[in-house]
């Protein structure tokens, strides 16, 4: 059977190492059946998640899944932190797992680390 609940597929323990000054698109994967749900992004601040009202977002539709994208153009140092997407569906609020952005400020780094370095050596983010 095909479930017609809305599903948000951000992965548990999801994280992305990105560079300040670069563009970045943060994906919220969404599965739905007939009507596309209203999806929003928020940024975690302690135990509350602050809704991101004025940020550029867009939908990307693929064959088996859709993406609600939060655009960073460009990434700023204070974009560092954890984000969550949520969907309103039939009066229910569905929340995703959180996803964490680790932002390296290239101005403060002695050299620009590669994506591979950032993926395999997370301590580069804090030097």
């Amino acid at each position: 059977k095909e479930s017609c609940d809305v599903q948000l597929y951000i992965k548990r323990q999801s994280e992305h190492s990105i560079l300040a000054g670069d563009p970045f698109e943060l994906e919220c994967p969404v599965k739905y059946c007939a009507n596309r749900p209203h999806v929003t992004w928020c940024k975690l601040n302690g135990t509350t998640c602050v809704k991101l009202e004025d940020r550029q977002t867009s939908w990307k539709e693929e064959k088996n899944i859709s993406f609600f994208i939060l655009h960073f153009e460009p990434v700023l140092p204070n974009d560092n932190g954890s984000y969550r997407c949520s969907a309103n569906f039939q009066s229910n609020l569905i929340e995703s797992h959180s996803t964490t952005l680790y932002v390296t400020d290239v101005k403060s780094a002695s050299e620009r680390p590669s994506k591979d370095e950032m993926a395999s050596r997370p301590w580069l983010l804090y030097r």
Partner: antibody, heavy 116, light 107 residues
Framework: QVQLQESGPGLVKPSETLSLTCTVS????????WTWIRQPPGKGLEWIGH???????HYNPSLKSRFTISADTSKNRFSLKLSSVTAADTAVYYC??????????WGQGTTVTVSS | AIQLTQSPSSLSASVGDRVTITCRAS??????VAWYQQNPGKAPKLLIY???SLESGVSSRFSGSGSGTDFTLTISSLQPEDFATYYC?????????FGQGTKLEIK
């Protein structure tokens, strides 16, 4: 329609480094997660690890730290490196797309034999 | 790591039979289970995701159920092309482990 194609040497000598590439056509690796799985002869499937659209990686800790997954967005492909191979690394290696809910697209697999 | 134990490891059945394969997780994994079919010399093929959702293009004789630690794959009426090996996989926690497989053979 997204298609995946593995490539690499069929035969590797013990202690050498194995390099495999998965070329993605019909879609971009700038979305989704991209996975490597292996299957030793006559045995089950083993999840090696994956790389995300941003370049972040997760690996199977039971496989020690000999694996490295990387991606080349300009060539729309991702790669697996395995250092210090032994006979126990003989397997069919598959690349697959993690469509977030499951591994929904697979390559046909490439057989790797470790032998001197 | 989360362990997935499939039972039975092998199963003999006839065309037209109803068959059930089970997958038990070592801890609660909600509904984050997928089922795959693998024929000899071929790559696995996705059948079921989220424990009970049928992948597009897959025959409706395949169905999945379960949540928490116990999951089942059912084939309602076996066809000749269904004789293969079946694997469950969990997506709840890293690493994304597979069950050891269930080989379905013709009786």
């Amino acid at each position: 329609q997204v298609q995946l194609q593995e490539s690499g040497p069929g035969l590797v000598k013990p202690s050498e480094t194995l390099s495999l590439t998965c070329t993605v056509s019909g879609g971009s690796i700038s979305s989704y997660y991209w996975t490597w799985i292996r299957q030793p002869p006559g045995k089950g499937l083993e999840w090696i690890g994956h790389i995300s659209y941003s370049g972040s990686t997760h690996y199977n800790p039971s496989l020690k730290s000999r694996f490295t997954i990387s991606a080349d967005t300009s060539k729309n492909r991702f790669s697996l490196k395995l250092s210090s191979v032994t006979a126990a690394d003989t397997a069919v290696y598959y690349c697959a797309r993690d469509g977030y809910y499951a591994l929904d697209v697979w390559g046909q697999g490439t057989t790797v034999t470790v032998s001197s | 790591a989360i362990q997935l134990t499939q039972s039975p490891s092998s199963l003999s059945a006839s065309v037209g039979d109803r068959v059930t394969i089970t997958c038990r997780a070592s801890q609660d994994i909600s509904n984050t289970v997928a089922w795959y079919q693998q024929n000899p010399g071929k790559a696995p093929k996705l059948l079921i995701y989220d424990a009970s959702s049928l992948e597009s293009g897959v025959s409706s004789r395949f169905s999945g159920s379960g949540s928490g630690t116990d999951f089942t794959l059912t084939i309602s009426s076996l066809q000749p092309e269904d004789f293969a090996t079946y694997y469950c996989q969990q997506f709840n926690n890293y690493p994304y482990t597979f069950g050891q497989g269930t080989k379905l053979e013709i009786k």
